[in-house]
């Protein structure tokens, strides 16, 4: 679709005569008829296949034609066409005398023709005017012409339709050749695809308008490049959504079980060494002079009964001092000036001479110890109870009173509540400090996974538009991962209709 434009510039008829040679009375009141048709090697009469146009009376005899409206007519003259411009044409321009006001062909005498010119040739679409001048024996006509495309038509033949738009169906203007030129922020064949916020993750993010970044389920952050861990994940991270990969020192399904109590809580006091011995369990190895589960109690150096042979111990600032009974000497009263003749062995101990009677040794009955069998055996001095167990002397033997969660002669065994397989329906059992916890498979719940609950949340195919469904096993819910172009909790909305703000 386009327009053939003809601009009449000057008509000369100095003698004011008709084509027949007869003069006009009082002068030639001149108007023009134009016929535009397909190319003919010899221009002949016949239908004006590309259109016709007539002007009002533009002047008398000789005159110049103004560039704008003239007496209600238009200059340049417009000959619109609704087809592909063929590139060639034939043009007939007739100048007529109008004796009266009626310019219809049937109202004019047949000899009212002043002049007729006919041209043909090739003409490309363009903004530039072609100037021409046609002369006959009595008249001269100067004019120019061109072909331009109608609004929204482009290309060499005005055959390419392109209408700029900025709506759901496209965001573009038109180039001179009719190709689309996308508005800033849009791309794609029809400029319908927004260009997301720079850096927006290609898979995890999308956008419905330029320079935004909307996150798919399980992703967050300005560029949708940070995954959201499993709901309930306490001390863990993820590399894909809903994971819970535990930080060092933490365990369990939700990374909430403390496997490094020593580091996280520093329970051992007074410079003691802490050793992890299971979930929320530890053992403190005390420095000399300290005791207690957490080495919180300061020991008197005399508590270890360092003085032998009935020597009495006195605490001093820099240690201790032994007061020896008669017949003994040395730092710990370990040297004797006695012999078996002095009956030095107490509590039924038997005396044996050594070094030709210069010394002796006592052989003690059970439950007694010391150089002279003077000490009752304290079987707890070696601190035999593990995991913070309390040692108790019971006559000739000893026993360990264990902390909750431990058992065995020396509290060396961790009580496993899971040993009897208490979790039903394939539930996973986790030992806790004061009991156990069952992690139930999908479809079961309850303290022991004994209650049958809902089936796979994705079984009902809740996601639309070929979205991928993921089941959140901890909540029996589903999450839809939408394909490009769709949003919504079930991927039910096309991107062009973004969900409205909740308020």
């Amino acid at each position: 679709s386009g327009v053939f434009q003809l601009q009449l510039q000057e008509f000369i008829n100095e003698r004011g005569v008709l084509a027949s040679g007869r003069p006009c009375e009082p002068g030639c009141r001149t108007f023009f008829r134009v016929c535009l048709k397909h190319f003919q090697a010899v221009v002949s009469p016949g239908p004006c296949t590309f259109g016709t146009v007539s002007t009002p009376v533009l002047g008398t005899n000789s005159f110049a034609v103004r560039d704008d409206s003239s007496g209600g007519g238009r200059n340049p003259l417009q000959l619109p066409f609704n087809f592909t411009w063929p590139g060639t044409f034939s043009l007939i321009i007739e100048a007529w005398h109008a004796p009266g006001d009626d310019l219809r062909p049937e109202a004019l005498p047949p000899d009212a023709l002043i002049s007729k010119i006919a041209i043909q040739g090739s003409l490309a679409v363009g903004q530039n005017w072609l100037l021409d001048e046609q002369t006959s024996t009595l008249t001269r006509l100067r004019y120019s012409y061109r072909v331009i495309c109608s609004d929204n038509y482009y290309g060499d033949n005005c055959s390419r339709l392109c209408k700029k738009r900025n709506d759901h169906f496209g965001h573009y203007v038109c180039q001179p050749d009719g190709n689309l030129s996308c508005l800033p922020g849009w791309t794609g064949e029809y400029c319908q695809q927004p260009i997301c916020l720079s850096g927006c993750h290609e898979q995890n993010g999308y956008c419905s308008k330029p320079a935004e970044c909307l996150c798919r389920p399980g992703w967050q952050g300005r560029l949708c490049n940070e995954c959201i861990p499993h709901n309930g994940c306490r001390h863990g991270t993820c590399s894909t959504p809903w994971q819970c990969t535990c930080d060092e020192g933490w365990g369990g399904l939700f990374c909430d079980q403390d496997l490094n109590y020593c580091t996280h809580h520093s329970p051992c006091k007074n410079g003691a060494t802490c050793s992890n011995s299971g979930q929320r369990s530890y053992t403190c190895t005390c420095r000399p002079g300290y005791t207690g589960v957490d080495c919180e109690l300061e020991l008197s150096e005399c508590d270890s009964n360092p003085c032998r042979n009935g020597g009495s111990c006195k605490d001093q600032e820099d240690g201790y001092h032994c007061l020896c009974p008669p017949g003994y000497y040395g730092l710990h009263c370990e040297h004797s000036t006695l012999s078996c003749a002095d009956s030095p062995c107490f509590n039924g101990g038997s005396c044996r001479e050594r070094n030709q009677g210069a010394n002796y040794a006592c052989e003690c009955p059970p439950n007694f110890t010391g150089s002279n069998c003077e000490k009752k055996v304290d079987r707890c001095t070696s601190n035999p109870c593990a995991n913070g167990g309390q040692c108790l002397n019971r006559g000739p033997s000893r026993m360990c009173r264990c902390r909750p969660g431990f058992t065995g002669t020396y509290c060396e065994l961790h009580v496993s509540d899971c040993a009897r397989n208490p979790c039903a329906h394939g539930g996973t059992c986790h030992d806790l400090e004061n009991g156990l916890m069952c992690t139930c498979p999908a479809g079961f719940s309850g303290r022991r996974c004994e209650v049958r609950t809902s089936i796979d949340a994705c079984a009902s195919s809740p996601c639309f538009n070929r979205a991928t469904c993921y089941t959140d096993l901890s909540t029996d819910t589903f999450v839809c991962n939408c394909p490009y172009g769709f949003v919504g909790s079930r991927c039910e909305f096309p991107v062009g209709l973004p969900p409205s703000f909740p308020w």
Partner: nanobody
Framework: EVQLVESGGGLVQPGGSLRLSCAAS????????MSWVRQAPGKGPEWVSA????????YYADSVKGRFTISRDNAKNTLYLQMNSLKPEDTAVYYC????????????????WGQGTQVTVSS
């Protein structure tokens, strides 16, 4: 059930201060980015500030930069907004929300959001 409950709003004179709180429950608060959004009477919602899940990265709208401070306490499941040098144009209902979409200046789509708390700045 996910719940975000804002508090701390009220009437304050221009130049004054307020501290808003948002208590979260029903989801693992420490795993989510959080933001404050406000809506003035007769206007659309306006993003105010945002903070990442760990609390070490913060974002502010130009209109509040230098006056407002966003923070969070993951142990207490609580988000805060300290508002200083308040102006009459800060009058709005303030919401806390989890952002799920960002534009060139800040978040503009949200997953969870609260019921809001009214802040009025007037002499």
């Amino acid at each position: 059930e996910v719940q975000l409950v804002e508090s701390g709003g009220g009437l304050v004179q221009p130049g004054g201060s307020l501290r808003l709180s948002c208590a979260a429950s029903g989801f693992t608060f420490g795993n989510y980015d959080m933001s404050w959004v406000r809506q003035a009477p007769g206007k659309g919602p306006e993003w105010v500030s945002a903070i990442n899940s760990g609390g070490d990265t913060t974002y502010y709208a130009d209109s509040v930069k230098g006056r407002f401070t966003i923070s969070r306490d993951n142990a207490k499941n609580t988000l805060y907004l300290q508002m200083n040098s308040l102006k009459p144009e800060d009058t709005a209902v303030y919401y806390c929300a989890t952002p799920r979409g960002w534009g060139p200046t800040g978040p503009h789509e949200y997953g969870y959001w609260g019921q809001g708390t009214q802040v009025t700045v007037s002499s």
